[in-house]
Interface confidence: low
């Protein structure tokens, strides 16, 4: 899997998971969410060659296309497979709520 | 949606459908199928920029991080949404099969 | 994919000058587009770029001292007040793409345009 | 704004020897990779040798090799030819400064 595991342990240039940490108020210019005050986001980024986690049967296709054709702008993208929540803390007024973020996190990437 | 209905009409840079016609024995090497010669594959591509047909809450993150952050290399990426499958004749021997091949045909994008 | 700077001529200090950089084989929406100068003899410098969303960012030494606007095919520099010191070649460079997503860099600049020699002389 | 130190000029190398150039930035760069290095010769515009500090692009040969992370970085030319007489100069890209991006002095290499 194109994951933590993987992708942090390997210098690969081709699709993985990057990290990224993504500050609320400076990279976003969110400043109502109270805590955190930013969190791992991580991002998918890299080459898409032929048969490289490829995600499904068009994507093969097109990555094969891809190599026998590779003046052509039709590629395969790298981009997130599995995301989780994030779990954060605002303000409405002086009442604190707490709600869960859904697909925050990139865990894992695929060539799509 | 970033389908044909939309994306053929329209001159459109951001991440829409776009045509892409492949020849089985030209474009991929491919011998073994026996019809059709090729088909209507399409592909997707264009920016990504923020809140553009968005996939999930990370995507959106991301397209806003890019706006603030444009030099950086974390941004979403145009991929396919909805696939189709294609209908395939091929021999084994001189024993003629149909098979469906699954998630062949691109019918719509999204910022992923 | 290609780039060309066009606009450099003598002027006289003072005088606004607009150079253009013309692109073609890709679209200005997908791709962020720099501003690089060259005195003569000297190093680069970059002044600044514009974002595939239209967004300026310029290098501090050349806020208002330079303008970056873009049409669907051409970006444009404009030199407000030019100033014998603005006497360079000045290139245009596309951020290359790096892996499956256009808008990233990496600091790679490539393709650059050929340059154009702007005199600034009274 | 990030300051970018290179090797003083000229630097001397023989033919089928080896030169190294350093690049030093007064701040980390962008993601600790954002570092490129630029061939340049009389007339003509600066060529892409090396982008995200060690990644060569498509086509410069593997005797130039880029090494580094962070604020200290190396270009070497190994198995030095006549047609690397140039001026390289390094680049790094910035994150949250209005100054996204610095070019370094440059650093002629002379080819004896």
């Known amino acids: 899997a194109l994951d933590a595991a993987y992708c942090f342990r390997n210098v690969q240039d081709n699709c993985c998971l990057r990290p990224l940490y993504i500050d609320f108020k400076r990279d976003l210019g969110w400043k109502w969410i109270h805590e955190p005050k930013g969190y791992n986001a991580n991002f998918c980024a890299g080459a898409c060659p032929y048969l490289w986690s490829s995600d499904t049967q068009h994507s093969r296709v097109l990555s094969l296309y891809n190599t026998i054709n590779p003046e052509a702008s039709a590629s395969p993208c790298c981009v997130s497979q599995d995301l989780e929540p994030l779990t954060i803390l605002y303000y409405i007024g002086k009442t604190p709520k707490i709600e869960q973020l859904s697909n925050m996190i990139v865990k894992s990437c695929k060539c799509s | 949606a970033l389908d044909a209905a939309y994306c053929f009409r329209n001159v459109q840079d951001n991440c829409c459908l776009r045509p892409l016609y492949i020849d089985f024995k030209r474009d991929l090497g491919w011998k073994w199928i026996h019809e059709p010669k090729g088909y209507n594959a399409n592909f997707c591509a264009g920016a990504c920029p923020y809140l553009w047909s968005s996939d999930t809450q990370h995507s959106r993150v991301l397209s806003l991080y890019n706006t603030i952050n444009p030099e950086a290399s974390a941004s979403p990426c145009c991929v396919s949404q909805d696939l189709e499958p294609l209908t395939i004749l091929y021999y084994i021997g001189k024993t003629p099969k149909i098979e469906q091949l699954s998630n062949m045909i691109v019918k719509s994008c999204k910022c992923s | 994919q290609s780039l060309e700077e066009s606009g450099g001529r003598l002027v006289t200090p003072g005088t606004p000058l607009t150079l253009t950089c013309t692109v073609s084989?890709?679209?200005?929406?997908?791709?962020?587009v720099n501003w690089v100068r060259q005195a003569p003899g000297k190093g680069l410098e970059w002044i600044g770029y514009?974002?595939?969303?239209?967004s300026a960012y310029y290098a501090s030494w050349a806020n208002g001292r330079f303008t970056i606007s873009k049409t669907s095919a051409t970006v444009d520099l404009k030199i407000t007040s030019p100033t014998t010191e603005d006497t360079a070649t000045y290139f245009c460079?596309?951020?290359?793409?790096?892996?499956?997503?256009?808008?990233?860099?990496?600091?790679?600049?490539?393709?650059w345009g050929p340059g154009t020699l702007v005199t600034v002389s009274s | 704004a990030a300051v970018l130190t290179q090797t003083p000029s000229p630097v001397s190398a023989a033919v089928g020897g080896t030169v190294s150039i350093s690049c030093q930035s007064s701040?980390?760069?962008?993601?600790?990779?954002?570092l490129s290095w630029f061939q340049q010769k009389p007339g003509q515009p600066p060529k892409l040798l090396i982008y995200?500090?060690?990644t060569l692009t498509s086509g410069v040969p593997s005797r130039f090799k880029g090494s580094g992370s962070g604020t200290q970085f190396t270009l070497t030319i190994s198995d030095v030819q006549c047609d690397d007489a140039a001026t390289y100069y390094c680049?790094?890209?910035?994150?949250?400064?209005?100054?996204?991006?610095?070019f370094g002095g440059g650093t002629e290499v002379v080819v004896k």
């Open positions: 680049a790094g890209g910035y994150s949250g400064s209005s100054d996204k991006y610095a």
């Open positions: 514009i974002s595939y969303g239209g």
């Open positions: 460079a596309r951020h290359m793409q790096v892996g499956g997503a256009p808008t990233g860099s990496m600091a790679a600049f490539d393709p």
């Open positions: 995200g500090a060690s």
């Open positions: 084989g890709f679209s200005l929406s997908s791709y962020t």
């Open positions: 701040q980390s760069v962008y993601n600790n990779n954002y």
